[in-house]
């Protein structure tokens, strides 16, 4: 796994942003904006919500999701799980990479039924060419997207 | 936007820390310590709360703020907004880069009057030479600065 | 402190994961998995919970801990402190680098006595060869480890 940075190479990096189409409700991963505004791909590609690795190496991957609601919807578990997962051709199931669990609904106060919370994940993982990383949030109904600055997903080679 | 890392160049990086003078109360951004303790600037400069880019490129920018209080002061919205914003000569207004909203006041319980919460933001953005990045917190009164380890602001080129 | 990246050198990086043995209850730092699963060391070493620096430079260090509980244990302050600390041969005591305080116990709701919260820290610090970085959580009884994806500790040179 020796990894070199050659001075003539571009270092792979990406930052993808939340958009109205991010929440599919299909049970799949979140989808992301790749070009408009702050979003970009450099030395990485994108497919159906996934960052796709072109060049093997160690990557710092990160995601933030903005959560918000009014009280806690009925039938919604009080635990929200936000995670980064790897898809690899060598294994049939997604692999958990970085995961957080939060209980944000308890944040509604007597003076304010509206609550907001944010979940940030970041860490270094080794990724092979062709492997994919996706973001999942359960329950995604509480994710607030708005303008791409509050929920996002990115990576860069270290 | 092809960006190369030449082996003889220093990679721009900075870590700025909270200080007693960080909260201005003027509606401006937070101000930061740039030299003492853990704070440093390397290939970036600082002006009135802003990290100023010397060399164009993609930067991982980050900020953490420590929030704390007893209950929630009246006149203080129960939502706290913590964000990283860009100032560019090409546009008159600040542009949101990375933003979080939290509702920390709901954390005070009968068994504990004092609550603490922390907000972390980090992500990769493209910055041109001369552009500036600042941190804002609304309401800034709830930010705990003190010793420089709990609230901070930094960046490095990726 | 001029730091160069030579193209033939490997960039130091590490990602350590939580394991059943992480919580010692001895008042020491958290211990980590260094080899299995997602854990790795590259250009850094490990000793008794500490990442040990081999090559001096600026490092982005990070840690996430998953917190969880049922209500709040009696005798536990509602404040949880999660921090990254430096041990250096030149100074007898640990130095705080990055610290967060949270009040997660207040998150238990009437509909759910179980609560979850996550604390993320990350920032750039200068580390000399031989210096060590450790993670501490007070009260560590609330740290939830499980499978190495929820609580972790890492670093990479920038």
């Amino acid at each position: 796994l020796i990894q070199e940075r050659r001075s003539h190479e571009v270092n792979p990096a990406a930052h993808l942003t939340g958009a109205n189409s991010s929440l599919t409700g299909s049970g799949g991963p979140l989808l992301w904006e790749t070009q408009l505004g702050l979003a970009f791909l450099r030395g990485l590609s994108y497919h159906d919500g996934a960052l796709v690795v072109t060049k093997a190496g160690y990557y710092y991957i990160y995601s933030k999701v903005q959560l918000g609601g009014v009280g806690c919807p009925l039938g919604l578990a009080s635990t929200i799980t936000h995670g980064l997962y790897k898809r690899t051709p060598r294994y049939p199931e997604e692999l958990e990479l970085l995961v957080s669990q939060q209980s944000p609904c308890g944040r509604a106060t007597s003076s304010s039924r509206v609550w907001w919370d944010s979940s940030f994940l970041g860490g270094v993982v080794h990724l092979e060419a062709g492997e994919k990383v996706v973001v999942r949030v359960l329950d995604e109904r509480l994710v607030r997207l708005r303008d791409g600055t509050r929920s996002y997903f990115g990576a860069f080679m270290v | 936007l092809i960006q190369e890392r030449r082996s003889h160049e220093v990679n721009p990086a900075a870590h700025l820390t909270g200080a007693n003078s960080s909260l201005t109360g003027s509606g401006g951004p937070l101000l930061w310590e740039t030299q003492l303790g853990l704070a440093f600037l390397r290939g970036l400069s600082y002006h009135d709360g802003a990290l100023v880019v010397t060399k164009a490129g993609y930067y991982y920018i980050y900020s953490k703020v420590q929030l704390g209080g007893v209950g929630c002061p009246l006149g203080l919205a129960s939502t706290i907004t913590h964000g990283l914003y860009k100032r560019t000569p090409r546009y008159p207004e600040e542009l949101e880069l990375l933003v979080s909203q939290q509702s920390p006041c709901g954390r005070a319980t009968s068994s504990s009057r004092v609550w603490w919460d922390s907000s972390f933001l980090g992500g990769v953005v493209h910055l041109e030479a001369g552009e500036k990045v600042v941190v804002r917190v609304l309401d800034e009164r709830l930010v705990r600065l003190r010793d420089g380890t709990r609230s901070y602001f930094g960046a490095f080129m990726v | 402190l001029i730091q160069e990246r030579r193209s033939h050198e490997v960039n130091p990086a590490a990602h350590l994961t939580g394991a059943n043995s992480s919580l010692t209850g001895s008042g020491g730092p958290l211990l980590w998995e260094t080899q299995l699963g997602l854990a790795f060391l590259r250009g850094l070493s490990y000793h008794d919970g500490a990442l040990v620096v081999t090559k001096a430079g600026y490092y982005y260090i990070y840690s996430k801990v998953q917190l969880g509980g049922v209500g709040c244990p009696l005798g536990l302050a509602s404040t949880i402190t999660h921090g990254l600390y430096k041990r250096t041969p030149r100074y007898p005591e640990e130095l705080e680098l990055l610290v967060s305080q949270q009040s997660p116990c207040g998150r238990a709701t009437s509909s759910s006595r179980v609560w979850w919260d996550s604390s993320f820290l990350g920032g750039v610090v200068h580390l000399e060869a031989g210096e060590k970085v450790v993670v501490r959580v007070l009260d560590e009884r609330l740290v939830r480890l499980r499978d190495g994806t929820r609580s972790y500790f890492g670093a990479f040179m920038v």
Partner: antibody, heavy 121, light 107 residues
Amino acid sequence: QVQLVESGGGLVKPGGSLRLSCAASGFTFSDYYMNWIRQAPGKGLEWIADISSRDNTIYYADSVKGRFTISRDNAKNSLYLQMNSLRAEDTAVYYCARERGFGDYFGMDVWGQGTTVTVSS
Amino acid sequence: AIQLTQSPSSLSASVGDRVTIACRASQDISSALAWFRQTPGKTPKLLIYDASSLESGVPSRFLGSGSGTDFTLTISSLQPEDFAIYYCQQFNTYPLTFGGGTKVEIK
């Protein structure tokens, strides 16, 4: 300047009532928690009640629960303590105190001069 | 209720002396502790908050330390105005409680 001035103390018989007032000036009263603390002659300090700034959440010490009522009027920059069913052991100097509770600043940093309540037959 | 036990309850010292007062909480209160000084006939004055933060305008000879259950107030060089009663107070948990006080007298 920042100031708290208590009034309303006096001599009252056991079982009687008194209403203490605390007038605030020089700061944004509505931003702060407010507390009542008392000190019996020759004794230490005893916290008796507080009221939040935001939603008027109130807590009392067990020794006064059900007998004393704390309230505030942010429009008038005033804090009150209605004391009913007074007992001899309620005899004390009563202080109101402002409490900071945000970010880097905590603690009861501003106290009134105190008003004396004597409960005696 | 959380009990705060101060020790000693009284002490005699001279101007210029270094004085240490301890405050022990019956359970963990993190850093939610304040120290007050009260001179006869006067209102209490906040010296230290959040266990170790010096209140604005308070001389630097006052030093607060500790967290969890054990706290200390140190006066590095006693001045004439420091002969008074000192109280610790926890603001972490209801009901708020004060220590019994430590009387610092002239030797």
